[in-house]
């Protein structure tokens, strides 16, 4: 029909100009469309250059929409991570501050002379929580071994205790249980609590990382063509008012995001495991009551050592022989004051409950993020048709969209009518991210059972008082803690917000 040939390109001109492109490219009226490589080759208002520009623009717009959706999810995960991380670190810092404030008065030189050992223990716990490759049980055992050496010397200043005698003392330690049940209790509870806390926070970090990396995966050329056809070919073909048919849009985006949808199963597994591990935040071995109460076990341990001093000394002498007496040394130490214990169970502050309930709700909300992405983008970003089925843009003309909607994931795109997807070539970045999700899920499942996945051989029995028998590789750094320069000034180690004194830790 000659009349249709001379239809004006005014609407296309307006839309094209609004996108920032030069209007000189746009024909005044429709032209023959044999030159079109993506859109159907009927009469058109688009030149080759316009088609190329709009194809690039539609590709960029989809990538931007994808990044925007990812950014929202990333921001949510980052906020969660920061909130939990702040809370867990606050619990540990609080415990250390309490120790620094109360132990000098409660234990005198038994604390001040060993302040460095306590500082180092908290530093190691912090490092472990942050993901350092430390064996927590051995870290604790080594701490107790070192502390025993130091305290035994302090409780017997009249004795000459050379290194070989201290080595012997260390070998006896496990059988003697010098610190009572505190080391074992702390080890069992702290291992479970720290493993749960750190794996949960790591889970949030991995989830966020996966989203960030997947958002950077480029869309392939076949996807670009399909998106151009979906978004701008209606304009080129003179039906700019026709919006894409919903099922047509879903098929295009399911094809474009086929690899991303394959994240779904492992993503759900990860989020389920994260929700599950929050069960370990409560109760006597829970994160809140354990991490915030490390100092109470330390106090119990020192008290137990003082209470058992005479029995312990007798058994050590029995096992290691009579040490020499320093003729110029002071007499045996007087019985020390008994450190008053703070209540073991920290009353829950309510902060963690609030954090957990928010996190659970938000994690449930994003469980189907990857498979709902095509639908979300279509409904939120693609201005879908709400008209009756035969009035929407189907990729060829205004009319009904007949093909069925494809399933989710790469394998289901074998017959996608809109995007040619090679199902034999999965995207390697996304496969790597699926593997990261699997690994993190295994960590969380392991953590749920109280195990650190890096140290599956860790046994759950024994006293935990430490052997002191030589030096386990990389685990002997819990060393002497001397007092600050005046024996009257207890050493308070620098934490954010605390003033630095001489002899303090400096960051």
């Amino acid at each position: 029909d000659p009349a249709s040939k001379s239809r004006s390109c005014g609407e296309v001109r307006q839309i094209y100009g609004a996108k920032g492109f030069s209007l000189s490219d746009v024909p005044q009226a429709e032209i023959s469309g044999e030159h079109l490589r993506i859109c159907p080759q009927g009469y058109t208002c688009c030149t080759s250059e316009m088609e190329e520009n709009l194809a690039n623009r539609s590709h960029a717009e989809l990538e931007t929409a994808l990044r925007d959706s990812s950014r929202v999810l990333q921001a949510m995960l980052a906020t969660q991570l920061r909130s939990f991380d702040d809370h867990f670190q606050h619990l540990l810092n609080d415990s250390e501050r309490t120790l620094q404030a109360t132990f000098p008065g409660a234990f005198g030189e038994l604390y001040t002379q060993n302040a460095r050992a306590f500082r180092d223990l908290y530093s190691e716990l912090r490092l472990y929580y942050r993901g350092a490759n430390l064996h927590l049980e051995e870290t604790l055992a080594e701490f107790w071994a070192r502390l025993l050496e130091r305290l035994f010397k302090q409780l017997h200043p009249q004795l000459l205790l050379p290194d070989d005698y201290l080595d012997c003392l260390g070998k006896q330690a496990e059988a003697l249980r010098p610190f009572g049940e505190a080391p074992r209790e702390l080890r069992l509870r702290a291992t479970r609590a720290f493993v749960a806390a750190r794996s949960f926070v790591q889970g949030l970090g991995v989830a966020s990382d996966v989203v960030r990396k997947v958002a950077q995966v480029p869309l392939g050329p076949e996807c670009s063509r399909a998106v151009m056809k979906l978004v701008y070919c209606a304009h080129c073909l003179g039906v700019p008012g026709a919006r894409p048919c919903p099922d047509y849009c879903r098929n295009v985006l399911k094809g474009c995001l086929a690899n991303q949808a394959d994240l779904d199963a492992e993503w759900r597994n990860l989020l389920d495991s994260m929700v599950l591990i929050t069960d370990k935040f409560w109760g006597t071995s829970g994160v809140e009551s354990v991490i915030g109460s490390v100092h109470t076990w330390l106090a119990e341990a020192i008290n137990a050592l003082q209470d058992n001093r005479d029995t312990l000394t007798a058994k050590v002498i029995q096992g290691c022989g009579n040490p020499k007496v320093n003729p110029q040394g002071p007499g045996p130490e007087e019985k020390r004051r008994r450190g008053k214990l703070a209540p073991r169970e920290r009353p829950p502050s309510g902060t963690l409950e609030k954090l957990v309930s928010e996190a659970k709700a938000q994690l449930r909300d994003v469980q189907d993020f990857w498979i709902s992405l095509p639908g979300t983008l279509c409904s939120e970003k693609m201005a879908l048709s709400t008209a009756s089925d035969d009035r929407c843009w189907n990729g060829m003309a205004r009319g009904r969209y007949l093909p069925e909607v494809m399933g989710d994931g790469l394998a289901n795109q074998i017959n996608n009518p809109e995007v040619e997807v090679d199902i034999t070539k999965p995207d390697m970045t996304i496969r790597q991210q699926i593997m990261q999700l699997k690994i993190m899920t295994n960590r969380l499942r392991s953590a749920y059972n109280g195990n650190d996945v890096d140290f599956q051989d860790a046994s759950d029995d024994g006293s935990g008082s430490g052997s002191g028998d030589g030096c386990l590789d990389d685990l002997c750094s819990r060393k002497v803690s001397r007092k600050s320069s005046s024996s009257r000034t207890p050493l308070t180690h620098a934490l954010p917000g605390l003033s630095e004194q001489e002899g303090q830790k400096t960051s």
């Epitope: 002379q113 050992a117 500082r119 180092d120 530093s123 190691e124 490092l127 070192r146 050496e149 130091r150 010397k153 200043p157 000459l160 205790l161 050379p162 290194d163 201290l166 320093n326 040394g329 002071p330 030096c471 590789d473 990389d474 685990l475 002997c476 750094s477 819990r478 060393k479 002497v480 001397r482 007092k483 600050s484 320069s485 005046s486 024996s487 050493l491 001489e502 002899g503 830790k505 400096t506």
Partner: antibody
């Protein structure tokens, strides 16, 4: 056997900085605190500070807090000390020293690094 | 800071003589005192720790004694190879401090 090998002598200009190293071998580097000691003819031995290679925690002698910065590189089992704003008073031999066990007793010493500050 | 005072500054001895080097702390340091030997052009070497424990490989002519504020390093029979500077140091409190040293010379 335990060895601490320090970097060679340094001749530096006043106001400059210098970073000296101490490479440890023969033991678990992160297992023992590393200390730094200054020896000058006038002041005999002066303790500068210590670092826990496992955690990076440091403790300084107040006198050297603005002068020295202690760091470690765990991957190469090396401890470092940077001295800044050097003056002739900083001319000395600097030693790294490792504790015997957990008692602030230095059983192992590096061979020393002579730092000369001169214009 | 705890001040460690050594005396005498130097002493001349003959081989075979007994020598006692003194170290006094400005405040109680328990038995947290070590003794170091430094020969010319060498690094210091540990002799005694914990005021009176001889370190591995140190000849038994070296003996440490004392506690609280008064400490002594005794060489029962001086040998030619003992010509060196001797330093005491305390590890009781921060900052760790050393004495100014005693130079042992041979007559």
């Amino acid at each position: 056997q335990v060895q601490l090998k320090q970097s060679g002598p340094e001749l530096v200009k006043p106001g400059a900085s210098v970073k000296i190293s101490c490479k440890a071998s023969g033991y678990s580097f992160t297992g023992y605190y590393m200390h730094w000691v200054k020896q000058s003819p006038e002041k005999s031995l002066e303790w500068i500070g210590e670092i826990n290679p496992s955690t990076g925690d440091t403790t300084y002698n107040q006198k050297f807090k603005a002068k020295a910065t202690l760091t470690v590189d765990k991957s190469s089992s090396t401890a470092y000390m940077q001295l800044k704003s050097l003056t002739s008073e900083d001319s000395a031999v600097y030693y790294c020293a490792r504790e015997k066990r957990d008692d602030g007793v230095f059983a192992y010493w590096g061979q020393g690094t002579l730092v000369t500050v001169s214009s | 800071d705890i001040v460690m005072s050594q005396s005498p500054k130097s002493m001349s001895m003959s081989v075979g003589e007994r020598v006692a080097l003194s170290c006094k702390a400005s405040e109680n340091v328990g038995t947290y005192v070590s003794w170091y030997q430094q020969k010319p052009e060498q690094s210091p070497k540990l002799l005694i720790y914990g005021a009176s424990n001889r370190y591995t490989g140190v000849p038994d002519r070296f003996t440490g004694s004392g506690s609280a504020t008064d400490f002594t390093l005794t060489i029962s029979s001086v040998q030619a190879e003992d010509l060196a500077d001797y330093y005491c140091g305390q590890s009781y409190s921060y900052p760790l401090t050393f004495g100014a040293g005693t130079k042992l010379e041979l007559k």
